[in-house]
């Protein structure tokens, strides 16, 4: 440890490099300055991401993994720091950058949207479920007519290239479908998607985007919705959707539509049954939808409504006379 009267001069790290290690993923590496004295003190490093999005954090080790988009380039700095209770000593910054890839910005795709969905696996010998991925995009406004686009996704350590594309009238790929992926339904990692392109006439700027799974996961509708009327009680039941999440992880909305007077009742529930008091003169259609609750992951998308179930009377019953 430093003595109170001891002076220390901090030197910046050396050999600072940025290496692309995967789709939308870089590794920052550096070495302690070999001329740094007082090696026995607990030196730390402050890492600052300058672009594409500002961030900074501290670390004791001499490397750092970063998940980030790269189509705008990437720039970072690192410096040596020494902290105690009262003050912070810091060296000057060492900096490095990756330039934006070639191609004018107008050649890259725009409006990339992706959704994931869980489906039963037809190939599996066991009853198991797969996560599919569907992405769509628009052709860049400055992209030559012969441009062809190619999509890749990375989830964790797996990177896959799209094999099933949809095309526009010029034969350019504008959507991609992965029936099976290595994406985890319950995963907390970012999904990275890259669309690059090629043309004989000009360089096509790649475009990459990070997606949080909870924000793009299209939940399946609830299963086996049933509704029955006993007197003035409408009893509705259903089962949880096909999903990796267990039964306690779902919020539901029940929609009861009185087709006679148009009245619409929507109830939010955490259970898989609901009883409503109704009149016995009307016909009703009933639908249920689901979402993963915030107890189990960050709020996301609601499922589509289940197919409507019709209950109640078709005929217009005369009012009872006393």
């Amino acid at each position: 440890d430093l003595l109170p009267d001891e002076k220390i001069s901090l030197l910046p790290p050396v050999n600072f490099t940025i290496k692309v290690t995967g789709l939308a993923q870089v590794l920052l590496q550096w070495k302690p300055n070999p001329d740094q004295e007082q090696r026995n003190v607990n030196l730390e490093y402050q890492v600052k991401i300058n672009a594409p999005k500002e961030d900074d954090y501290e670390t004791r080790i001499t490397e750092s993994k970063c998940v980030t988009i790269l189509h705008k380039g990437f720039s970072a700095s690192v410096r040596t720091i020494l902290q105690n209770d009262h003050s912070l000593l810091a060296s000057s910054w060492a900096s490095a950058e990756l330039h934006a890839p070639p191609g004018s910005p107008g050649t890259s795709i725009v409006n990339l949207t992706c959704t994931t969905n869980t489906t039963e696996d037809n190939y599996s010998r066991l009853r198991s479920y797969q996560v599919s991925l569907h992405c769509t995009w628009l052709v860049g406004t400055d992209a030559p007519e012969d441009t062809q686009y190619f999509l890749y996704y990375r989830y964790g350590s797996w990177t896959e290239e799209c094999q099933e594309y949809s095309k526009d009238t010029l034969g350019r790929n504008i959507a991609c479908w992965f029936p099976r992926t290595f994406i985890l339904s319950k995963g907390r990692d970012w999904l990275a998607v890259l669309v690059n392109g090629s043309s004989k006439h000009s360089a096509i700027r790649p475009f990459d985007q990070l997606f949080a799974l909870h924000a793009i996961d299209q939940i399946n509708p609830p299963l086996n919705v049933t509704a029955e009327i006993e007197g003035t009680r409408l009893s509705i039941q259903w089962e949880k959707p096909v999903s990796a999440f267990p039964i306690h992880c779902f919020d539901y909305e029940v929609k009861i539509h009185n087709t006679r007077n148009g009245y619409l009742q929507i109830e939010k529930l955490m259970t898989n049954a609901f009883i409503s008091i109704i009149d016995d003169l009307s016909k009703y259609d009933v639908q249920v939808r689901a979402a993963v609750s915030s107890m189990c992951r960050e709020a996301g998308l609601w499922s589509e409504w289940s197919q409507p179930i019709y209950v109640g009377n078709d005929e217009h019953k005369p009012l009872r006379e006393w």
Epitope: S124, S128, R180, F182, L184, F245
Partner: antibody, heavy 121, light 112 residues
């Protein structure tokens, strides 16, 4: 029924190379991701590598990254593991297994009987 | 040192119930990732015993069951039989590791 048959194991000197093969039958090989898992003598299971159904995407354990290469020939229903720069700690029984997933979490539903690789001078 | 921790050995008499634990962390079992169990009889290849926490492939007796809570999982075997003597391994997914596949160190079950 599913059958996986490994071959190619044997005795090799440190720094040497070996190529393992796994012949698959009884299922549509090209629909499945595949994997290699090893077990050192008297020790537990260690996942080594995996490859997607089309053969274009691969994954490795840190302990073999840069030394081992997984590949497949769907026309021949065969999985391969090219092992270079072998070390004594690579000595193990190497199993070929399908790399199935449920909601994305991998598991190994079918296994071969294994082939022994011994790295020793 | 395995990422998932299992007791090296357990033993019980025929007919008894035995449980084998598998302890993980927030980056694997604690994140809700499924746990799978394998049985390896002496001198043979491993065999999938339980997948997705508690599902049995066809042919696996219902004496075997799996459960999970927090950062741990358990394999329970009831009505223990001599042929259950084997090594048992848990396996899951770990988001912090390259390749993501993680095994427990294995548990040797001895039927007394």
């Amino acid at each position: 029924q599913v059958q996986l048959q490994e071959s190619g194991g044997g005795l090799v000197q440190p720094g040497g190379s070996l190529r393992l093969s796994c012949a698959a039958s009884g299922f549509t090989f090209s629909n499945y991701a595949m994997s290699w898992v090893r077990q050192a003598p008297g020790k537990g299971l260690e996942w080594v590598s995996a490859i997607n159904s089309g053969g274009k995407s691969t994954n490795y354990a840190d302990s073999v990254k840069g030394r081992f290469t997984i590949s497949r020939d769907n026309a021949k229903n065969t999985l391969y593991l090219q092992m270079n720069s072998l070390r004594a700690e690579d000595t193990a029984v190497y199993y070929c297994a399908d790399y199935a997933t449920n909601y994305g979490v991998p598991y190994f539903g079918s296994w071969g009987q294994g082939t022994m690789v011994t790295v020793s001078s | 040192q395995s990422v998932l921790t299992q007791p090296p050995s357990v033993s019980a008499a025929p007919g008894q119930r035995v449980t084998i634990s598998c302890s993980g962390s927030r980056s694997n079992i604690g994140s809700g990732y499924d746990v799978h169990w394998y049985q390896q009889l002496p001198g043979t290849a491993p065999k999938l015993l339980i997948y997705d926490d508690n599902n049995r492939p066809s042919g696996v007796p219902d004496r075997f069951s799996g459960s999970k809570s927090g950062t741990s999982a358990s394999l329970a075997i009831t009505g223990l039989q001599a042929e259950d003597e084997a090594d048992y391994y848990c396996q899951s997914y770990d988001s912090s590791l390259s390749g993501h596949v993680v095994f427990g160190g294995g548990t040797k079950l001895t039927v007394l």
